[in-house]
């Protein structure tokens, strides 16, 4: 028996993945549920099995094709259904029409690397992953640097208001260990949100030259 307040939230990674989370107060943990995707103008449909991620929350990824294939466009509408097994039949729990390019969340940036490091500055580059060519240059980035003795939450956010896949960090302390993260967001979409943060890149600034002021 499934009742109570439910919530169904999905995001499109701009290429071939729709990730969904369904939560239901009072749902049984062992309830078998799935998400079914029916695009309005495609010949394919797709299903994924919702797996528990917390006490009353389930998640799954609709894999629409090869990771870099462009499976949906700005004119597509996908009807998403949550179905849960009740005895021998499936019961529809939620129905949502979903415009993929209004609900974007890209993959985290990858391939972070230190291009050049000095005593007080460091140049870092990265790449975006599985991002649609439709965006052209209409992307923005946020970056943050973890300093010794601080937390990620305390790190100030650096905003790059254009598609710039590098940054020059300045006013760093010599011979100090830092970590760096970046995330990306398209400019379009009613519910578009930031990607997850990239894996942290650790780097160390060069020591100050002996006999010189720091």
């Amino acid at each position: 028996a499934v009742n109570g307040t439910s919530q169904f939230t999905c995001f499109y990674n701009s290429r071939a993945n729709i990730s969904c989370v369904w939560s239901q107060d009072g749902a049984l943990q062992d309830t078998s549920c799935q998400v079914h995707a029916w695009p309005d103008r495609r010949r394919w449909n797709q299903t994924c099995e919702l797996l528990p991620v917390s006490q009353a929350s389930w998640a799954c990824n609709l894999i629409l094709g090869a990771p870099d294939s462009q499976k949906l466009t700005t004119v597509d509408i996908v009807t998403l259904r949550v179905l849960c097994r009740e005895g021998v039949r499936w019961r529809v729990m939620a129905i949502q029409d979903f415009k993929p390019f209004e609900n974007l969340r890209l993959m985290a940036p990858i391939s972070l690397q230190v291009v050049h490091v000095e005593t007080h500055r460091c140049n870092i580059s990265w790449e975006i992953s599985q991002a649609s060519h439709y965006f052209e240059r209409h992307l923005e980035f946020e970056a943050r640097t973890l300093s010794p003795g601080h937390t990620w939450e305390e790190a100030p956010l650096l905003t790059l208001k254009q598609k710039q896949e590098w940054i020059c960090l300045e006013t760093l302390t010599p011979d100090t260990q830092y970590e760096f993260q970046v995330r990306v967001k398209p400019l379009q979409g009613e519910f578009t949100t930031w990607s997850p943060w990239s894996q942290p890149l650790a780097f160390r600034t060069k020591p100050a030259a002996l006999g010189k002021d720091t």
């Epitope: 307040t5 439910s6 919530q7 169904f8 939230t9 939620a94 949502q96 029409d97 979903f98 415009k99 209004e102 609900n103 979409g189 009613e190 519910f191």
Partner: nanobody
Framework: QLQLVESGGGLVQAGGSLALSCAAS????????MGWFRQAPGKEREFVAA????????MYAVSTEGRFSCSRDNAKNTVYLLIKNLKPEDTAVYYC????????????????????WGQGTQVTVSS
């Protein structure tokens, strides 16, 4: 304040289709989430569909069985409800409603979440 006027209702044979419209005036239409509700004779008003301010997400009552389609055109200040394969049990007064507070289209809203209502349009399905 936004005013809503529904149109497109009427008498239809079972199996037919109908397109309902709801025209808004007197406010910034794109600032409102929009919903459709219906009330059959002797029954409570029930949720049919709700769409977000930009139309990026639209939730449907599970009872709609994929026969209903809700869309909006912010340039025309209008929200639509297309009903296919009509059944006698679809007979009801259909109401358009607007919601001032934010709605993200991830859950089923209650009728009390909507603060502006149209006068309704009658849909009668004959068998």
């Amino acid at each position: 304040q936004l005013q809503l006027v529904e149109s497109g209702g009427g008498l239809v044979q079972a199996g037919g289709s109908l397109a309902l419209s709801c025209a808004a005036s007197g406010g910034t239409f794109s600032s409102y989430a929009m919903g459709w509700f219906r009330q059959a004779p002797g029954k409570e008003r029930e949720f049919v569909a709700a769409t977000t301010r930009g139309g990026g997400r639209t939730m449907y009552a599970v009872s709609t069985e994929g026969r209903f389609s809700c869309s909006r055109d912010n340039a025309k200040n209008t929200v639509y409800l297309l009903i296919k394969n009509l059944k006698p049990e679809d007979t009801a007064v259909y109401y358009c409603a607007a919601r001032t507070s934010y709605y993200d289209g991830t859950y089923y809203p209650a009728s009390s979440d909507f603060d502006i209502w149209g006068q309704g349009t009658q849909v009668t399905v004959s068998s």
